[in-house]
Interface confidence: low
């Protein structure tokens, strides 16, 4: 399907406000530190451009593939080597090198400022003074926030951050209406940066097989009664969206997404009764609903997977004949029926499986040998049951934010050599699984802890990648993505770091603890007791939680003093000297 | 032949207690997770509880948490349901089954016994 310019095409399907969106996105997306204004004014220019080849396809230039265009314009920055420094020799490159070097440089931990809300009243002044702007601003700040952000998704935060200003800003108390709708896209945006940066990093380093893999789990366990034909095609299309996507290729993967919502929309019938109330809705809802669509259920007669997969004298032959379609479709047959596991546990079994056919359908009675597969499946599935049921125990027990503790001791513990603000972001990240999931009924379990786990972790890979310090971390990140996991839940004490020496800046703290918010004040209190860890790896639970308990109480009665910052000034050196004391 | 026998069913007033046995044959309990399944009248399956092939990781259904302990016998190649506090709800024909990897899943239940019938009324 070839079009004589690919820019006037994709403007012409996806609409100029799409357009500009997804460029505006793409922009920020490679170029992170780059002032608004300057990416509206590039923004401008290709639109612009654009609609002349809209208007004649055989205009100059208009030929040219996108990469190129928007190359070429990216590279018309003037302050490139100054602000990116070696991205800049991107430039001297030819399309398709110079892409992949803009790729190479997107920074997934830029050092931007931490957004702050402004007052109400003031977000919606500039709310009505111009709406254009205002939206074109929040996709700009949280682009550049979020190099990997999925952009068709993207836009549908944008619609909704529009709607909530829409409606708040004309509401009786303003605050009260648009403060929660704000906190729930937040929250909502990190969730889906991050599941989506797990997407990239299956795509990138682990190439497009991987990622084919998870997507059939997870369509066959949404799509229990689709047939694996119907599975196949969807999962080639997703593939698709993504590749192109991670890839920086905003326009065609919007677009491609679109005509996947189409087709599925066309098309319920034979993939799943759920799908229904999300055709109803407008393009970028519709798109959003079918991603999340609830699993339907399960066909009622589905035979025993034992008899085409370990009971059959066929299984060698049909393996050999094609490996992947006959993973595949063992994998399409295990996840329909059990909307119970994990995708990455459903990955490991058909990892499994696949191992032992390579080695049995070699041997001299294939049969024999692999007819016990299925009872080498069950250490693998009772660990992640047992790990979930061990940790909600712990959850419930604890609480949310002494479980994040419990879990920032874990892994301090296990990678010492981890930067402190890493530690602390992956492991309170870590720690929301327990509310997160532990309320689920047991059968909802394991796919929502397992694979919420696998995406915190990936955002620790992704760190640790930009800066390496640890074998352990690189280990598990790379040798295999299904088993990330449980390489770092296999991570015991690193014997071998030497602990880091007591710095008593680190423990010195001023009367500016007091005015922090709540959560605030858990990132400090999180962030010394990484840094305890560190200088003290072999220190008990009990030992810990004593100098947190009077780090807290030192916090509250300093807090509590008239001269707050003499107090801190006179009790932080006893506070030390008792930790140290404490923890020798 | 691959078997399984339940007995220990009966009447019995609320509050009060009954221990189900189950009796493999033709295989090891010690090899599979060995599942409780009971189904209400006029109601679907519904599971009750689990113990793990090495016996480490035992599950039971919220319904039951605390009254009801699941347990095996290697030696006598059994499993067992000591039920305690039982209610009126509890009434159900008890089925105990294999389950061939862990799966938590009734209908992928490959070995059933006949089940053994609690009545619990006052």
């Known amino acids: 399907d070839t079009h004589k310019s690919e820019v006037a095409h994709r403007f012409k399907d996806l609409g100029e406000e799409h357009f500009k969106g997804l460029v505006l996105v793409a922009f920020s997306q490679y170029l992170q530190q780059c002032p608004f204004e300057e990416h509206v004014k590039l923004v401008n220019e290709v639109t612009e451009f654009a609609k002349t080849c809209v208007a004649d396809e055989s205009a100059e230039n208009c030929d040219k593939s996108l990469h190129t265009l928007f190359g070429d314009k990216l590279c018309t920055v003037a302050t490139l080597r100054e602000t990116y420094g070696e991205m800049a020799d991107c430039c001297a490159k030819q399309e398709p090198e110079r892409n992949e070097c803009f790729l190479q440089h997107k920074d997934d931990n830029p050092n931007l400022p931490p957004l702050v809300r402004p007052e109400v009243d003031v977000m919606c002044t500039a709310f009505h003074d111009n709406e254009a702007t205002f939206l074109k601003k929040y996709l700009y700040e949280v682009a550049r926030r979020h190099p990997y952000f999925y952009a068709p998704e993207l836009l549908f935060f944008a619609a909704r951050y529009k709607a909530a200003f829409a409606e708040c800003c004309q509401a009786a108390d303003k605050a009260a209406c648009l403060l929660p709708k704000l906190d729930e896209l937040r929250d909502e945006g990190k969730a889906s940066s991050a599941k989506q940066r797990l997407k990239c990093a299956s795509l990138q380093k682990f190439g497009d097989r991987a990622f084919k893999a998870w997507a059939v789990a997870r369509l066959s366990q949404k799509f229990p009664k689709a047939e694996f034909a119907e599975v196949s095609k969807l999962v080639t299309d997703l593939t698709k969206v993504h590749t192109e996507c991670c890839h920086g290729d905003l326009l065609e993967c919007a677009d491609d997404r679109a005509d996947l919502a189409k087709y599925m929309c066309e098309n319920q019938d034979s993939i799943s009764s759920k799908l229904k109330e999300c055709c109803d809705k407008p393009l970028l809802e519709k798109s959003h609903c079918l991603a999340e669509v609830e699993n339907d259920e399960m066909p009622a007669d589905l035979p025993s997977l034992a008899a085409d997969y370990v009971e059959s004298k066929d299984v060698c032959k049909n393996y050999a004949e094609a490996k992947d379609v006959f993973l595949g479709m063992f994998l399409y047959e295990y996840a329909r029926r059990h909307p119970d596991y994990s995708v990455m546990l459903l990955l490991r079994l058909a990892k499994a499986y696949e191992a032992t056919l390579e080695k049995c359908c070699a041997a001299a009675d294939p049969h024999e040998c692999y007819a016990k597969v299925f009872d080498e499946f069950q250490p693998l599935v009772e660990e992640p049951q047992n790990l979930v049921k061990q940790n909600c125990e712990l959850f419930e027990q604890l609480g949310e934010y002494k479980f994040q503790n419990a879990l920032l001791v874990r892994y301090t513990k296990k990678v010492p050599q981890v930067s402190t603000p890493t530690l602390v972001e992956v492991s309170r990240n870590l720690g929301k699984v327990g509310a997160k999931c532990c309320k689920l009924p047991e059968a909802k379990r394991m796919p929502c802890a397992e694979d919420y786990l696998s995406v915190v972790l990936n955002r620790l890979c992704v760190l640790h990648e930009k800066t390496p310090v640890s074998e352990k971390v690189t280990k598990c990140c790379t040798e295999s993505l299904v088993n990330r996991r449980p390489c770092f839940s296999a991570l015991e004490l690193d014997e071998a770091y030497v602990p880091k020496a007591f710095n008593a800046e680190t423990f010195t703290f001023h009367a500016d603890m007091c005015t922090l918010s709540e959560k605030e004040k858990q990132v400090k209190k999180q962030t010394a007791l990484v840094e305890l860890v560190k200088h003290k790896p072999k220190a008990t639970k009990e030992q810990l939680k004593g100098v947190m308990d009077n780090f807290a109480a030192f916090v509250e009665k300093c807090c509590k003093a008239d001269d707050k910052e003499a107090c801190f000034a006179e009790e932080g050196p006893k506070f030390v000297a008792a930790s140290q004391a404490a923890l020798a | 032949e691959v078997q399984l026998l339940e007995s220990g069913g009966g009447l019995v007033k609320p509050g009060g207690s009954l221990r189900l046995s189950c009796a493999a044959s033709?295989?090891?309990?010690?090899?599979?997770?060995m599942n409780w399944v009971r189904q209400a009248p006029g109601k679907g399956l519904e599971w009750v509880s689990s113990i793990s092939s090495s016996g480490r990781y035992i599950y039971y259904a919220d319904s039951v948490k605390g009254r009801f302990t699941i347990s095996r016998d290697n030696a006598k190649n059994s499993l067992y349901l000591q039920m305690n506090s039982l209610r009126a709800e509890d009434t159900a024909v008890y089925y105990c089954?294999?389950?061939?990897?862990?799966?938590?899943?009734?209908?992928?239940?490959?070995?059933w016994g006949q089940g053994t019938m609690v009545t619990v009324s006052s």
């Open positions: 089954a294999r389950d061939p990897r862990m799966v938590g899943n009734p209908h992928e239940f490959d070995i």
């Open positions: 033709g295989f090891t309990v010690s090899s599979y997770t």
